[in-house]
């Protein structure tokens, strides 16, 4: 395991897989597209989603303090957003080809996930909200969402890991 | 079963209007993006353009764009192709498609209509 | 708009032969956007392959993809009898383009 006994994780490969992330959650749904969906309604499905904010430890000095605050939110993070890629909004009409990079995300949000789950302890997950689109086609304006705050949870996540790697690593 | 059909072949003057259908069937035809493709007589195929009927979001090809228009009705699962004015060079196959999600956004057209032949002479 | 060449423009082998088919474009392809479809005479068009190397549903193993960047190649290990067709390549990244296809044959 990476935390064991609650210690500081393997940053390095903490570091090289959050990197694997943010390439894949890029490639699941990239900037530039030949189309993207319009955005209708106001309506925000995505509020309940994890954010990795100021007071959670994971600026430098919070690092060095205690990482365990900052790797707890991150890790919560990971696992919510674990569920709701193997959830029915992902694996529904319209299905995803198989190899689709959404499916090599959803199996690495779980491996980093593992790594930072300490041995004999198991951090608090936050419950994934009820989103049920009533329309089928509705699941891909989610689906972009979901993605889109991802990505922005992802690049929170590797920015933290390689500042682990290079400062905190044994 | 996945299937698209479309409707049958039409023969037609210039200057002529003309909608051509593709009926989806055995899926979620409102969620996946049905896109239209252009074979000349003894030619390659060419990206038309393509529709998500659950909301009608539409995008073409430049070299179509404003030369056909691209519709659907949902509640039938029916994607249409028309021209207010056919020309003689508009003779071709045309097949309409539903494109697979690689990603959220695009992917590979995995199931095809059989194809609508249009045939425009004077 | 991304122009893909295909190459050679017919192919003139005989069944149990192996066929390589290039697909070369204009400027650089994600391999994740790459597919290639077979067409039969009078029949529509047929997926083989997309994201540069996975096989399609159904599709026997025989045919393989691979390449990246510009550069993609389709391989039939050992041509069947039903495997004489036209081959096109297809980018569907950004505005869809199509190869003009390449003709396989019997020799």
């Known amino acids: 395991r990476a935390v064991p006994g609650g210690s500081s994780p393997a940053w390095t490969q903490c570091q090289q897989l959050s990197q694997k992330l943010c390439t894949l959650a890029w490639s699941a749904h990239p900037l530039v597209g030949h189309m993207d969906l319009r955005e209708e309604g106001d309506e925000e499905t995505t509020n309940d989603v994890p954010h990795i904010q100021c007071g959670d430890g994971c600026d430098p000095q919070g690092l060095r303090d205690n990482s365990q605050f900052c790797l707890q939110r991150i890790h919560q993070g990971l696992i919510f957003y674990e569920k709701l890629l193997g959830s029915d909004i992902f694996t529904g009409e319209p299905s995803l080809l198989p190899d689709s990079p959404v499916g090599q995300l959803h199996a690495s949000l779980l491996g980093l996930s593992q790594l930072l789950q300490p041995e004999g302890h198991h951090w608090e997950t936050q419950q994934i909200p009820s989103l049920s689109p009533s329309q089928p086609w509705q699941r891909l304006l989610l689906r972009f969402k979901i993605l889109r705050s991802l990505q922005a949870f992802v690049a929170v996540a590797a920015r933290v890991f390689a500042h682990g790697a290079a400062t905190l690593s044994p | 079963e996945e299937q698209l059909v479309q409707s049958g072949a039409e023969v037609k003057k210039p200057g002529e209007s003309l909608k051509i259908s593709c009926k989806g069937s055995g899926f979620s035809f409102d969620s996946y993006w049905i896109g239209w493709v252009r074979q000349l007589p003894g030619k390659g195929l060419e990206w038309m353009g393509i529709?998500?009927?659950?909301?009608?979001?539409?995008r073409y090809s430049p070299s179509f764009q404003g030369q056909v228009t691209i519709s659907a009705d949902k509640s039938i699962s029916t994607a249409y192709l028309q021209w207010s004015s056919l020309e003689a060079s508009d003779t071709a196959m045309y097949y309409c498609a539903r494109q697979a999600y690689y990603d959220l956004l695009t992917g590979p057209f995995d199931y095809w209509g059989q194809g609508t032949l249009v045939t425009v002479s004077s | 708009e991304i122009v893909l060449t295909q190459s050679p423009g017919t192919l003139s082998l005989s069944p149990g032969e192996r066929a390589t088919l290039s697909c070369r474009a204009s400027?650089?392809?994600?391999?994740?956007?790459l597919a290639w479809y077979q067409q039969k005479p009078g029949q529509a068009p047929r997926l083989l392959i997309y994201?540069?190397?996975s096989r399609a549903t159904g599709i026997p193993d025989r045919f393989s993809g691979s390449g990246s960047g510009t550069d993609f190649t389709l391989t039939i290990s050992r041509l069947e009898p039903e495997d004489f067709a036209v081959y096109y390549c297809q980018q569907y990244g950004s505005s869809p383009t199509f190869g003009g296809g390449t003709k396989v044959e019997i020799k």
């Open positions: 529709i998500l009927p659950g909301n009608s979001d539409t």
């Open positions: 400027q650089s392809v994600s391999s994740s956007y």
């Open positions: 994201g540069a190397s």
